[in-house]
Amino acid sequence: PKQTLPKPIIRAESTYMVPKEKQATLCCQGSYGAVEYQLHFEGSLFAVERPKPPERINGVKFHIPDMNSRKAGRYSCIYRVGELWSERSDLLDLVVTEMYDTPTLSVHPGPEVTSGEKVTFYCRLDTATSMFLLLKEGRSRDVQRSYGKVQAEFPMGPVTTAHRGSYRCFGSYNNYAWSFPSEPVKLLVTGDIENTSLAPTDPTFPDSWDTCLLTRETGLQKDLALWDHTAQNLLR
């Protein structure tokens, strides 16, 4: 079988939802010593980066300026050490937002409810779209989808304090082109007194895993790595 290197990790820096005409940054974290990284878009080569010096860097950033619907879709990356290529990374869905119009988000029976009550969000957008998306701030990877001609509903069922937080919705023109976000609706859930202290308030900053953890190897790290390699050989 053909030998391959471990697959790299692909991430979007700050967010995978990029407003049109703004810049997206994707990070591909591979291995120290990789001489080339390739970013693929919908199966075709999109961009190449050759880190300098390769032995000191464990990944690269790919910049996608001027975001639009032509650049929205599925990205992956690979890297090369010598003549040996890695496996392909997982796929990353890059979405362009702020297309066309702004939907309206409402909640029934209202934004202040008691634990155990049934809550339904309604997202309305008058321009032609059939798919709607509901996102909770700080949980942007947990996208709920619903369908409707001009309005979609998102039944939440009986809510708990874990449902507390700020919600926004989008209209979607395809999987990767979304409308402007709605104004946020803050859901306040009271009750469940014994659980209240356990329910963390959602962060208002972007999802913490949407960051690029690329590092430059220092001389000390290199010495430690060499020492570890030598020790492993001695143990064998």
Epitope: F41, A47, H63, P65, K71
Partner: nanobody, 126 residues
């Protein structure tokens, strides 16, 4: 706004050489990644060669070893030196730019480019 103007196209015999130039207006040239694409009659536009801000290059397999891309930041110009030309190299050649860019990304996909020239025709025939 960036404007790109290609020149240097023309008719040449198989095995011959040509040098295409692409002059860019504006002060953003040094921060732009540049590329050359071509479109033959009745065919899709295809990638030829690209160069990063720092001068790293990437070529389509079909032109590797025959074409060389280079840039002169002082002159706001990118070049495509074409040698050992073949009949299948006949096409309209387009210069393109990604502005702004950071790091040393080399862009290969046409969707990455946000500025395009009008093109210059290269004809290779005996």
């Amino acid at each position: 706004e960036v404007q790109l103007v290609e020149s240097g196209g023309g008719e040449v015999q198989p095995g011959g050489s040509l040098r295409l130039s692409c002059a860019a207006s504006g002060r953003t040239f040094a921060s732009a990644a540049m590329g050359w694409f071509r479109q033959a009659p009745g065919k899709e536009r295809e990638f030829v060669a690209a160069i990063s801000r720092s001068g790293d290059t990437y070529y389509a397999d079909s032109v590797k070893g025959r074409f060389t891309i280079s840039r002169d930041n002082a002159k706001n110009t990118v070049y495509l030196q074409m040698s050992s030309l073949r009949a299948e190299d006949t096409a309209v050649y387009y210069c393109a730019a990604v502005v702004p860019t950071y790091g040393n990304n080399i862009y290969v996909h046409s969707a990455a480019y946000n500025y395009w020239g009008q093109g210059t025709l290269v004809t290779v025939k005996p």
